[in-house]
Interface confidence: low
């Protein structure tokens, strides 16, 4: 189903504002009608246009060359260019064959302003829209061009062809038609208004500047379809593929017609399966069939005649070569010639597009760009070359700092970095309690080598990972004072290092006398247990970087703070010790700030108060 | 055909403004998807600058990204291109054109320059430092 926006952007698509109505009357217009677009005959033939399980539909693009003229490489489409609507939206059905698809209602049409050229090049192609949910709309994509030049004359026939585009085929046909008052087979002749005296006889129409010149018009069977129908006798009515009935009227695939060939049926009105002449396309090197009373014609490119068009008369006067290549051969008419093409075109005129990116050139992960006059590669960091074959040394003269060694890996260079360090070249202070190491809600306190786990009741371990009693008893030993058991805000550390903490306490002490004092709660630092003496004992600094908790006293109202903001208020905590365990609780009265590096914004850690020599830190 | 008139170019000092106009006339029986413009600086490759759809939406080649704003006016059958903070990189014929997108308005920048269905004849920019 196609959503309401997209219907919008079809019915804008359909009127561009900035292409407006004619404001003088063209010569004529070219038309073009597709008869079926599908997968050729043989094998390898593509099963649907439509990728798996996503709807599309198909629209068309010809856009019109003179013939004569030497085309550039990047030329626009001299005579005109249309696109047409798009066609009812297919959907694949798996395991059906493969159908030809359905395809958008009515002609293209190109307007001309001059002379109809009578030879003239064309190039058509067919566009998949797919509808899935991609970002920014539908995706479109090229499925075949065809190309090809022919002769043509205003006012004639429709004529038919054949063209195969890889496993594609497109079978359509053709006419250009004069815009009254023009007339002729280039429509360069102006027809005087009916009502001027005239000296024709009766049914005929009167022409400047040749006043003695008239012209029978050519008139089809009344009623004759105008779409569907044509005629090249008067009061005749022959019907384009597809379609059937005396005026052309009915479309062949709503009746239960088994070939859109021979005579009509009397009984059904349907058409009794024949062999068409122009089936198979007789006509060869790209000529157009058009069936005739009696047979078929050929209406041949430029330098081919006979028959079927099977004999080449080209020569590189006849600028048989497109998109800008170059004609190779003699001027005479019996001498072959060869198209050299340009980069990013193909086949025995030039008249295919190649995807070069489909090649994929690039190595080791490039992006490739098809400029047009050459490709190019985009490469991955740590390759270089013309298709990023080189594979560059990305350590050679980069160091890492702080200890840091480089690691070359997928060509790209980085750096392991010792531990408390990282980003590109280890020169920013890493935090080691990011990854959020000590389980069973224990609490990560980063150390300049490492960190340590201070561990919630029952657990123990490195990083937390051992229950204290496997069989479920309870491990917690009394609180302290004033701190009650059963206090979520509590955290127990290992005795051990509950010991070491002690034994460092001093030191500590000593040690953080010296940090300046500073009031400002945004910059929070230290916090002190409530009437304890100023500065007895420190927090363990930056502790608490990885855990929700409940900010205020246990017994207070209090507020959620998350320890993973980075620029909130950094609380932190006060122990209180007591053999063989620490306990844990925060004050909200800040004091010291944390300290800082020399850069804006990037905190450093604070020595931990006891020595590291003691410690093991994993 | 449809035919493609630009104006507006001239010589101006780096930093400067222009605002480029293409009037398009002529006559389409179908539509086309995008109008736009690209540029040609002598012994340079051709490059897409700006391409607008018929939705508006709009895309910029990176050198251009936030100084050109392109627009159209459909009532006046005009697609603009203003042209702000110039540099003197941005020396160049500066060319309307008209045509099928191919894949989306950010491609039609590329479609342009390969194919366009229609073009104009264009209008010197120079930018002098």
């Known amino acids: 189903m196609v959503s309401p926006r997209m219907s919008g952007l079809l019915s804008q698509t359909v009127i561009l504002a900035l292409i407006f109505l004619p404001q003088t009357r063209p010569a004529g217009v070219f038309e073009l009608q597709i008869h079926s677009f599908g997968p050729g005959p043989g094998p390898g033939a593509p099963r649907s246009p439509c990728s798996a399980r996503l709807p599309c539909r198909l629209f068309f693009r010809v856009c019109l060359k003179p013939g004569l003229s030497e085309e550039a490489a990047e030329s626009p489409c001299a005579l005109g260019a249309a696109l047409s609507a798009r066609g009812p939206v297919y959907t694949e059905q798996p395991g059906a064959p493969a159908p030809d698809l359905p395809l958008p209602d009515g002609l293209l049409q190109v307007p001309f302003r001059d002379a109809w050229p009578g030879t003239f090049s064309f190039i058509i192609e067919t566009w998949r829209e797919e509808l899935g949910d991609q970002i920014g709309g539908p995706a479109w994509s090229l499925l075949a061009r065809v190309a090809g030049r022919r002769r043509l004359a205003a006012g004639g026939p429709w004529a038919r062809d054949i063209q195969r585009a890889g496993a594609w085929e497109l079978r359509f046909s053709y006419r250009a038609r004069c815009e009254p008052p023009a007339v002729g087979t280039a429509c360069t002749r102006l027809c005087r208004p009916r009502s001027a005296p005239s000296r024709c006889g009766p049914g005929l129409r009167p022409c400047a500047p040749l006043e003695d010149e008239c012209e029978a018009p050519l008139v089809c069977r009344a009623g004759c379809s105008p779409e569907h129908g044509f005629c090249e006798q008067p009061g005749e009515c022959r019907c384009l593929e597809g379609w059937t009935g005396p005026l052309c009227t009915v479309p062949v695939s709503t009746s239960s017609c088994l070939s859109p060939r021979g005579p009509s049926s009397a009984t059904t009105g349907c058409l009794v399966p024949g062999p068409g002449p122009c089936d198979g396309n007789p006509c060869a090197n790209g000529g157009s069939c058009s069936e005739t009373p009696r047979s078929f014609e050929c209406t041949c490119p430029r330098g081919f005649y006979g028959l079927r068009c099977e004999v080449s008369g080209v020569t590189c006067a006849d600028g048989p070569c497109f998109n800008g290549g170059l004609c190779v051969g003699g001027a005479d008419p019996d001498s072959a010639y060869i198209c050299h093409c340009p980069p990013g075109f193909q086949g025995s005129n030039c008249e295919k597009r190649v995807d070069r990116c489909s090649l994929q050139p690039c190595r080791n992960g490039g992006l490739c760009l098809d400029l047009g006059h050459a490709l190019r590669c985009r490469c991955r960091a740590g390759f270089a070359g013309p298709r990023c074959e080189h594979d560059l040394d990305d350590c050679a003269g980069r160091a890492c700092a702080n200890g840091g060694t480089c690691v070359e890996g997928g060509g790209a260079h980085r750096c392991s970095c010792a531990l408390g360090f990282g980003g590109r070249d280890c020169r920013e202070r890493a935090d080691p309690c990011a990854a959020r190491p000590c389980a069973h809600g224990g609490r990560c306190y980063a150390h300049f080598s490492g960190l340590v786990c201070a561990c919630a009741p029952g657990y123990m371990g490195a990083r937390c990972e051992f229950p204290v009693h496997p069989d479920g008893a309870s491990a917690l030993p009394a609180a302290p004072p004033g701190l009650r058991p059963g206090d979520p805000q509590r955290y127990l550390l290992p005795p051990a290092l509950g010991l070491l903490v002690a034994a460092g306490v001093a030191g500590a002490a000593l040690l953080l006398v010296h940090v300046r004092r500073r009031g400002h709660s945004q910059d929070a630092g230290s916090r002190l247990l409530a009437g304890t003496p100023e500065p007895s004992v420190h927090a363990l600094p930056d502790a608490l970087n990885n855990l929700r908790t409940q900010e205020g006293s246990g017994d207070g109202p209090s507020s959620s703070v998350d320890w993973n903001r980075p620029e909130d208020v950094d609380p932190q905590g006060i122990y209180v010790i007591s053999a063989p365990s620490i306990y844990a609780r925060e004050v909200a009265t800040p004091l010291f700030p944390p300290l800082h590096t020399g850069r804006a914004g990037q905190r450093q850690h604070l020595l931990f108060p006891y020595p590291s020599s003691i410690l093991s830190v994993k | 055909q449809v035919r493609l008139v630009e104006s507006g170019g001239g010589s101006v000092q780096a930093g400067g403004s222009l605002r480029l106009s293409c009037v398009a006339s002529?006559?389409?029986?179908?539509?086309?998807?995008?109008m736009g413009w690209f540029r040609q600086a002598p012994g340079k490759e051709r490059e897409g600058v700006a391409a607008?759809?018929?939705?508006?939406?709009?895309s910029y080649a990176d050198s251009v990204k936030g100084r050109f704003t392109i627009s159209k006016d459909n009532a006046k059958n005009t697609l603009y291109l203003q042209m702000n903070s110039l540099k003197p990189e941005d020396t160049a014929m500066y060319y309307c054109?008209?045509?099928?997108?191919?894949?989306?308005?950010?491609?039609?920048?590329?479609?342009?320059?390969?194919?366009?269905?229609?073009w104009g004849q264009g209008t010197q920019v120079t930018v002098s430092s």
């Open positions: 607008i759809d018929t939705d508006g939406r709009t």
């Open positions: 002529g006559y389409f029986y179908n539509t086309y998807y995008f």
């Open positions: 054109a008209a045509g099928f997108g191919y894949m989306n308005v950010i491609q039609a920048l590329n479609g342009m320059r390969q194919n366009p269905d229609y």
